[in-house]
């Protein structure tokens, strides 16, 4: 058993049938010594009196708020959740497997820039009872700090028959250079409880390697005379690292219709302009990546050819 | 401590077309013993990350675009001196820190070329030959090298007595080749700003 | 499969013309971009121009711009590549392409040699 | 016109050995080039297209790398069907040009 804060407590236990479960012992925290009651959850029955509760915990039966009174008076709780390991292995009931870039992926990151922010969500069919506490640094024998906001549900969506819930949050390394050679690679760790579930999720990653920039921006078409074939500009994405002539992005310009098996123009480049065939009921798209670090490409920005 | 933004005249820069070559060698070079030693740990996230230059030069403070000077977290840097002759430097008017930022490539090139020719050595040894470092990435590292054209102190190739552990050599040209190719994008990333500068 | 089948060799004296068929099966015929390319004896690869046969856009090099013409017929899902005044060293194996991406060539017609000789 | 130059016009290798093939090109085109094998009597074939990317059917020991002015394709262990003329072809800007081409040939 293990505090996970202030009158919260994990109880890990071996998840097998008949398992001995675990033996806890719970403390009043008060001064008194005499007249003192257990009770579990919004049950008035009497588990057990004195200073301290000795209980097996087995099964979510046996989880919950416990809570020490007397004469009728609450004198402190303790809750008590369960993390299971079922074949040495923790359970990963309560989120989704995104299995992108591999399996066993529940937390996806990724950062717009060099400057230390960067993004982690993850995906859940749970709609209720569901909290989630995030915790980054640099390293993890001589953690440097990451500051991570609150968790908040980002987007929903409906899967089949399911709803799907994906929860996001933000973290920004206290002190970044966009500059840096990345040595120790950051940690992420996710504590996810429901109801009275308790699991951990972690993701280990440099920035590096989790980059996307964001589409380029400002993207414009002037037909060249005399030809099928259009110039098409753009610019860096504000969100990008600066200077861009030392985090320089390379560019992949495509022209193609409304579906992915019509044929396409497309050429590469490291400038911010190319000349491509346009063709009517079609799109010019260009995406960015990082030209030296290839890491992933960014979203389409678009423009109708016409 | 940082580039100035005023340097060599545009189409002076012999170094970022070696620069690119080099990128493109150490690359491929990391792309094959991924795949050739697929049975040891040789991903990026299964390896220690080590510099083997750590403490010797500084190339990322030394390099530092004009523009991340006012990022504190940018400039804890330890002062290096090095010597400031160099091919790349194109102009009479190139600063002292441009000096001291090419040099410390050159400082980098020189430690891990010494690393990679003694571990191919011992990799030669390997009854089993199954991987040794590719002659074009040792060839690209000797013409930026000249490119850059410091005179340096030559460092002498490291000799070992005792029979090698081709496991632990193998391991550790992952180590090598995945730290060469970060400094390999540093690289290129600062012969792109000079050049644009 | 996707498959493309040249018409058969010709010999033409200078001055003249060829015009040259490459009939597609195996896929939509409007789904892909159709070049030609060109190959002297003993020599490299030259590539013509190319033609959308969705909506008859073409681009030809400019070495061929002004003699050749290249069309389509959607119905008979054959591509015609017409050269016009031709020299002795138009000689060449003449190759149809098609792609679904414009620059490159993926699936290659047979070739169809042409000899201009007087 | 983009003029791309290969090198060596001629290579001469012993089955089982490894072939590295060069293409250049005058200006910076990214990675839009793409090899070609051709042999006697027949049309070229699609091996790698743009610079590194593989296709399937082709056989791995084919391998494309480069960007910008300098690209390689390379034969891990050449087998004898492997002995045929290679080309590169860029596709930066029209018109779409091919180099002249390596002779791979048995040593």
């Known amino acids: 058993i293990w505090e996970l804060k202030k009158d919260v407590y994990v109880v890990e236990l071996d998840w097998y049938p008949d398992a001995p479960g675990e033996m806890v012992v719970l403390t009043c925290d008060t001064p008194e010594e005499d007249g003192i009651t257990w009770t579990l959850d919004q049950s008035s029955e009497v588990l057990g009196s004195g200073k301290t509760l000795t209980i097996q915990v087995k099964e979510f039966g046996d989880a919950g708020q416990y809570t020490c009174h007397k004469g009728g008076e609450v004198l402190s709780h303790s809750l008590l959740l369960l993390h299971k390991k079922e074949d040495g292995i923790w359970s990963t009931d309560i989120l989704k497997d995104q299995k992108e870039p591999k399996n066993k992926t529940f937390l996806r990151c990724e950062a717009k820039n060099y400057s230390g922010r960067f993004t982690c969500w993850w995906l859940t069919t749970i709609s209720t009872d569901l909290t989630f506490s995030v915790k980054s640094s640099r390293g993890s024998s001589d953690p440097q700090g990451v500051t991570c906001g609150a968790a908040t549900l980002s987007a929903e969506r409906v899967r089949g028959d399911n709803k799907e819930y994906e929860y996001s949050v933000e973290c920004q390394e206290d002190s970044a250079c966009p500059a840096a050679e990345e040595s120790l690679p950051i940690e992420v760790m996710v504590d996810a409880v429901h109801k009275l579930k308790y699991e951990n999720y972690t993701s280990s990653f440099f920035i590096r390697d989790i980059i996307k920039p964001d589409p380029p921006k400002n993207l414009q078409l002037k037909p060249l005379k005399n030809s099928r074939q259009v110039e098409v500009s753009w610019e860096y994405p504000d969100t990008w690292s600066t200077p861009h002539s030392y985090f320089s992005l390379t560019f992949c310009v495509q022209v193609q219709g409304k579906s992915k098996r019509e044929k396409k123009d497309r050429v590469f480049t490291d400038k911010t302009s190319a000349t491509v065939i346009c063709r009517k009921n079609a799109s010019i798209s260009v995406r960015a990546q990082d030209r030296y670090y290839s890491s992933s490409w960014s979203e389409w920005a678009s423009v109708p050819c016409s | 401590r940082n580039l100035p933004v005023a340097t060599p005249d545009p189409g002076m820069f012999p170094c970022l077309h070696h620069s690119q070559n080099l990128l493109r060698a150490v690359s491929n070079m990391l792309q094959k013993a991924r795949q050739t030693l697929e049975f040891y740990p040789c991903t990026s996230e299964e390896i220690d990350h080590e510099d083997i230059t750590k403490d010797k030069t500084s190339t990322v403070e030394a390099c530092l675009p004009l523009e991340l000077t006012k990022n504190e977290s940018c400039l804890n840097s330890r002062e290096t001196s090095f010597i400031t002759n160099g091919s790349c430097l194109a102009s009479r008017k190139t600063s002292f820190m441009m000096a001291l930022c090419l040099s410390s490539i050159y400082e980098d090139l020189k430690m891990y070329q010494v690393e990679f020719k003694t571990m191919n050595a011992k990799l030669l040894m390997d009854p089993k030959r199954q991987i040794f470092l590719d002659q074009n990435m040792l060839a690209v590292i000797d013409e930026l090298m000249q490119a850059l054209n410091f005179n340096s102190e030559t460092v002498p190739q490291k000799s070992s007595l005792e029979e090698p552990d081709f496991y632990k050599t193998k391991i550790k040209l992952c180590i090598l080749l995945h730290a060469f190719r970060i400094r390999a994008v540093t690289i290129d990333r600062v012969m792109s700003y000079l050049n644009a500068s | 499969q996707v498959q493309l089948v040249q018409s058969g060799a010709e010999v033409k004296k200078p001055g003249a013309s060829v015009k040259v068929s490459c009939k597609a099966s195996g896929y939509a015929f409007t789904d892909y971009y159709l070049h030609w390319v060109r190959q002297a004896p003993g020599q490299g690869l030259e590539w013509m121009g190319w033609?959308?046969?969705?909506?008859?856009?073409?681009e030809y090099a400019p070495k061929f711009q002004g003699r050749v013409t290249m069309t389509t017929d959607t119905s008979t899902s054959t591509a015609y590549m017409e050269l016009r005044s031709l020299r002795s060293d138009d000689t060449a194996v003449y190759y149809c392409n098609a792609n679904k991406e414009l620059r490159y060539f993926d699936v290659w017609g047979q070739g169809t040699m042409v000899t201009v000789s007087s | 016109e983009i003029v791309m130059t290969q090198s060596p016009a001629t290579l001469s290798v012993s089955p089982g050995e490894r072939a590295t093939l060069s293409c250049r090109a005058p200006?910076?085109?990214?990675?839009?080039l793409h090899w070609y094998q051709q042999k006697p009597g027949q049309a070229p074939r699609l091996l790698i297209y743009?610079?590194?990317q593989s296709i399937s059917g082709i056989p791995a020991r084919f391998s494309g790398s480069g960007s910008g002015t300098e690209f390689t394709l390379t034969i891990s262990s050449l087998q004898s069907e492997d002995f045929a003329v290679y080309y590169c072809?860029?596709?930066?800007?029209?018109?779409?040009?091919f180099g002249g081409g390596t002779k791979v040939e048995i040593k």
């Open positions: 033609i959308d046969p969705e909506n008859g856009d073409t």
């Open positions: 743009f610079a590194s």
């Open positions: 200006q910076s085109i990214s990675i839009n």
């Open positions: 072809q860029q596709s930066n800007s029209f018109p779409l040009t």
